[in-house]
């Protein structure tokens, strides 16, 4: 049997050592003990007795099925306990009685049906993070379960086989910063929602089939809910259940962010937020994020005209990887407050983008992200976006563009342009001279000779440049990142010619460790201030005898350099 490995600070690693019991020889010097991925099965009352100063105990996936009642009695200093993914079919309050310093407790993934006969946590007054439940057997949440807990930073409950929720079970916790609920269906959602309304700031609902969700008024008095963010991950919705969910918003007037991640909409977007009060109550929602929305019948999807008014005050919208091919002109015109729009990984082409960015579209828009769509013409794209009078930042990276023409038109306020991973081989004057930030990384550029008088930041890593670009092209440059090119050298004169340069990242290039380069690096200890990735990323490519050496360590041959 292998033994533990401990470092000088008392951090001991015993992961995956085939232990069949808690190893002997534990001492008070131990601060952290990780015995995950073993076959321990049983923890006896004396097994951890010596670990009086232990602060972290991780026993994840160790097949534990029995823990003696007083097994943790000496662990008064323990702050972090992970018992997840074991075989504990019942939980005992006696385990946790002595753990008054505990801040983090993970009991998830054990096959218990309830949290025990009596309250488990009354003594855990310092607890900040609690993870409980499992996918298959945890079936009941009761009023006694959370007694003694008044405030938590994170509470995660995996109740994917929930059969019973006792009303007011979660109400005793007065403040929960982030509650994650894994529920397979919406059966108890309204009851739970009523109980957490006055305590939860961020509610995350996972893997919930909401297709049958139906709203009914909550049995709550006038409540000022602190909830700011609501996220649905892996959920299933229909047009009808979306309408029903909207009715919950009347109870969370401070909500500012809504997120749908990896959800399925079994519908056509035929939303009908019938109640006019819903519209006014969406007033504080500023951020809507949708990622990987699966709509089986996306080709029949409606124009969303029924929700135009809902979104008039929203400032930030992300709809990523969701087969978006058009934002109808009239919808764009209704998004009057929109400042940030991210449509990455969709199906946008110039023809439909023209309709989306019609006259009067997105009048407040400052940032537009169209990364990884199906745009082909840089010239057309720039022309189409001329309607966006306030646009300062455009990301059209990861589109495969035709060769760049000599001239293009762009929104006049544009200051940031991302053209990374677009396959460009040559940069031309199509790129606007107004830019302050330009990203052309991960392309096929072997030179860069474009004058950009206002450019402050240039990102040109992962190209084929053999030298640093000429400093006279960028009189006010502050930052240049030119990693992973074919740069073979740089000199005092080169670096000195960038009058304002504060940050240069030029590592992972093919440096020829000549006498000049090595003597320059030896004579210039201040390089570390400007080269942020110095010294580890600066390696000699040649001559052969110095290959792989750091420039900082490489020493030129006296013979070679003094001929």
């Amino acid at each position: 049997q292998e033994s533990l490995s401990c470092d000088a600070s008392g951090v001991c690693d015993g992961r995956s050592r085939s232990f069949t019991s808690i190893p002997s020889g534990l001492t008070a010097a131990m601060k952290s003990l990780d015995l995950s991925f073993n076959k321990i099965t049983y923890i006896g009352h004396g097994d951890l007795r010596a670990c009086a100063n232990l602060q972290v105990l991780i026993l994840k996936s160790s097949r534990i099925n029995t823990i003696e009642g007083d097994a943790f009695y000496s662990l008064g200093s323990l702050e972090h306990l992970d018992l997840s993914d074991n075989h504990l079919s019942s939980l005992s309050s006696s385990w946790f009685g002595p753990l008054s310093s505990l801040k983090y407790l993970n009991l998830m993934g054990n096959p218990y049906q309830t949290l025990g006969v009596t309250s488990l946590f009354p003594n855990l007054t310092n607890l900040q993070t609690l993870r409980i439940g499992n996918v298959e057997t945890f079936s009941e949440i009761r009023r006694i379960d959370f007694a003694g807990l008044t405030s938590l930073n994170e509470l995660e409950i995996k109740a994917l086989s929930l059969r019973n929720y006792q009303s007011q079970s979660l109400k005793s916790i007065r403040d929960i910063h982030h509650l994650t609920l894994h529920l397979s269906e919406s059966a108890f959602l309204l009851e739970i929602f009523a109980d957490i309304l006055s305590s939860v700031r961020y509610l995350e609902l996972r893997d919930t089939n909401l297709a049958r969700f139906q709203f009914s008024p909550l049995p709550v008095d006038e409540v000022s809910s602190p909830m700011k963010k609501l996220a649905f991950r892996g959920s299933v919705l229909t047009d009808e259940s979306f309408n029903e969910l909207l009715k919950l918003l009347r109870y969370i007037l401070e909500l500012s962010e809504v997120e749908f991640d990896d959800c399925t909409l079994n519908g056509l977007g035929d939303f009908n937020p019938s109640e006019s009060d819903v519209v006014s109550e969406l007033g504080k929602v500023e951020t809507v994020t949708i990622r990987r929305l699966h709509i089986p019948q996306f080709y029949l999807f409606y124009d969303l005209s029924t929700v135009y008014s809902l979104l008039e005050k929203v400032k930030r919208i992300t709809v990523e990887n969701s087969k978006v091919f058009l934002v109808p002109c009239s919808f764009s015109q209704h998004l009057k407050s929109l400042e940030f729009l991210d449509l990455s990984e969709n199906l946008m082409v110039e023809e439909y983008l023209k309709n989306s960015a019609c006259k009067g579209a997105w009048p407040s828009l400052q940032t537009l992200v169209l990364s990884q769509n199906h745009l082909r013409s840089m010239q057309k794209t720039g022309e189409i976006l001329l309607t966006l009078k306030n646009l300062t930042s455009l990301d059209i990276s990861r589109n495969t563009f035709h060769p760049m023409p000599d001239s293009c038109q762009w929104p006049e306020k544009m200051r940031f342009l991302n053209l990374s991973s677009t396959g460009i081989r040559v940069v031309k004057t199509c790129i606007p001279q107004t830019l302050e930030v330009l990203d052309v990384s991960n392309n096929n550029l072997d030179s860069f000779s474009l004058f950009l008088p206002r450019l402050q930041e240039l990102y040109i890593s992962r190209n084929k440049l053999k030298t640093l670009p000429d400093a006279s092209l960028f009189p006010v440059l502050l930052v240049m990142k030119i990693r992973e090119n074919a740069v073979s050298t740089f000199s005092k004169d080169q670096l000195g010619s960038f009058p304002k340069l504060e940050t240069l990242e030029a590592g992972d290039n093919h440096f020829v460790c000549s006498c000049e380069l090595l003597s320059f690096t030896m004579e210039t200890p201040a390089l570390a201030q400007i080269l942020v990735d110095w010294p580890d990323s600066y390696l000699c490519d040649s001559p052969p005898r110095l290959h792989g050496h750091r420039l900082q360590d490489a020493r030129p041959s006296v013979l070679e350099c003094h001929q």
Partner: nanobody, 124 residues
Framework: EVQLVESGGGLVQAGGSLRLSCAAS??????????FAWVRQAPGREREFVSV????????DYASSVKGRFTISRDNAKNTVYLQMTSLEPEDTAVYYC???????????????WGQGTPVTVSS
């Protein structure tokens, strides 16, 4: 009629590996609209949940008895769900069933469609 057909079971020595497959045969079946689970039944025992994967493959869960040894995955283009089983133990001997349903859960009774099962025998 939707048919789920399991394959890949067999006899293996303790410590060995197997990969089970579950293919959905009905073309009209909206494969990526369903969650899939693997459930096993040992002789004389009740059905026991093993693992579940959601529609997109973005969420997976496991019974504590198999976590770290088994991996569930799906290929929506091939209408197939897989269960990669490693470090097999005699206690894993059972008939393994594939099940599909609208709910992401470890409760076997919430699944609408079931396969016929594929037997796995782990000898010591």
């Amino acid at each position: 009629e939707v048919q789920l057909v399991e394959s890949g079971g067999g006899l293996v020595q303790a410590g060995g590996s197997l990969r089970l497959s579950c293919a959905a045969s009905e073309l009209a079946f909206d494969f990526d609209g369903y969650n899939f689970a693997w459930v096993r039944q040992a002789p004389g025992r009740e059905r026991e949940f093993v693992s579940v994967i959601n529609r997109s493959g973005g969420s997976t869960d496991y019974a504590s008895s198999v976590k770290g040894r088994f991996t569930i995955s799906r290929d929506n283009a091939k209408n197939t769900v897989y269960l990669q089983m490693t470090s097999l133990e005699p206690e894993d001997t059972a008939v393994y069933y594939c099940a599909a349903g609208p709910y992401y859960t470890g409760s076997s009774d919430r699944y609408d469609y079931w396969g016929q099962g594929t037997p796995v025998t782990v000898s010591s």
